[in-house]
């Protein structure tokens, strides 16, 4: 039985050219996290964090994706094309798979604020 819940940074905005932290947190379960996958809105994989092998950053994102903090992901040198949905998929044992959603809006405006509140999607 899957008892856990995924908390995410929810809907966030960030400035073009800046950086943003994508963060998911799995709570209310003792399940062991074996792998976390980070996907973009078009379902392309940005990065994988595997418990045995570590972080794998996909070649297309190597220059502007940094692991962490924790199991999160830092997306750098933001462009308008980065606007959209991001998904964290937690593969756990014995529970199975948990999935969280974050919506990122990249703004031209210099007053863009990065909202970092945690919320359950």
């Amino acid at each position: 039985m899957m008892t856990g819940t995924i908390e995410t940074t929810g809907n966030i905005s960030a400035k073009k050219g800046g950086s943003v932290i994508l963060q998911c947190h799995l709570s209310s379960t003792m399940a062991q996290v074996t792998q976390v996958n980070w996907e973009q809105h078009d379902h392309s994989l940005l990065a994988i964090r595997n418990a045995e092998l570590g972080w794998h950053i996909y070649p297309a994102f190597k220059d502007r994706v940094a692991p962490g903090p924790g199991l999160g992901l830092t997306l750098q040198s933001l462009t308008m094309n980065d606007t959209g949905e991001y998904f964290c998929t937690y593969h756990t044992y014995p529970d199975g798979t948990y999935r969280g959603r974050i919506f990122l809006e990249v703004l031209e405006s210099s007053v863009a604020e990065h909202s970092a509140r945690f919320q359950i999607p």
Epitope: E52, L53, W55, P67
Partner: antibody, heavy 119, light 107 residues
């Protein structure tokens, strides 16, 4: 006791292929990621490739990417390294290694199998 | 890829000496660093994992420290059996990488 035994090494011409095997015993093979590490004569250690317990994630050193393929057969407690388009610089002693669970240090190593690429 | 730079590449020391080997990563790797000892004709032996955790059966004169990009392996009092080559290895990012090695020789 925990043991890893490599085999399949030998003398091969540049451009040819070779398949290395590693037979594991003394531990539950299917529970562990596994790795290949090599050492050229008189040189340092070079990580070659790693594979998760279920083959779900695989990594390669840039020097072998596209030429080498790591695989495993959990039913046979065996790890493999298929080496294609071999080059002189692939000449090395190839070790199979097992990690400390989830801590990523390699705590058990085989004795190694020597691969010599020469015409 | 992460480059690991070990220094010195070799060190001459005497029995009883304190020996320090450093390993610097080209990017932060948290604490995902291991240290190995290798003697001629033998497979490497794991000494330290997680930057500072001593592998079972390894003498307490070996210790590791550091986090992020700078790491240290210390042998508090060198013993005759410690003359060997030492390697650091990162496991934060794929591909994993090793340092170039440090040879500890008899002075």
């Amino acid at each position: 006791q925990v043991q890893l035994v490599e085999s399949g090494g030998g003398l091969v011409q540049p451009g040819r292929s070779l398949r290395l095997s590693c037979a594991a015993s003394g531990f539950t093979f299917r529970d562990y990621a596994m790795h290949w590490v090599r050492q050229a004569p008189g040189k340092g250690l070079e990580w070659v490739s790693g594979i998760t317990w279920n083959s779900g994630l695989i990594g390669y050193a840039d020097s072998v990417k596209g030429r080498f393929t790591i695989s495993r057969d959990n039913a046979k407690n065996s790890l493999y390294l298929q080496m294609n388009s071999l080059r002189a610089e692939d000449t090395a002693l190839y070790y199979c290694a097992k990690p400390v669970p989830r801590l990523r240090g390699l705590d058990v190593w085989g004795q190694g199998t020597m691969v010599t690429v020469s015409s | 890829d992460i480059q690991l730079t070990q220094s010195p590449s070799s060190v001459s020391a005497s029995v009883g000496d304190r020996v320090t080997i450093t390993c610097r990563a080209s990017q932060g790797i948290s604490s995902w660093l291991a240290w190995y000892q290798q003697k001629p004709g033998k497979a490497p032996k794991l000494l330290i994992y997680g930057a500072s955790s001593l592998q079972s059966g390894v003498p307490s004169r070996f210790s590791g420290s550091g986090s992020g990009t700078d790491f240290t392996l210390t042998i508090s009092s060198l013993q005759p059996e410690d003359f060997a080559t030492y390697y650091c290895q990162q496991a934060f990012y794929l591909p994993w990488t090793f340092g170039g090695g440090t040879k500890v020789e008899i002075k």
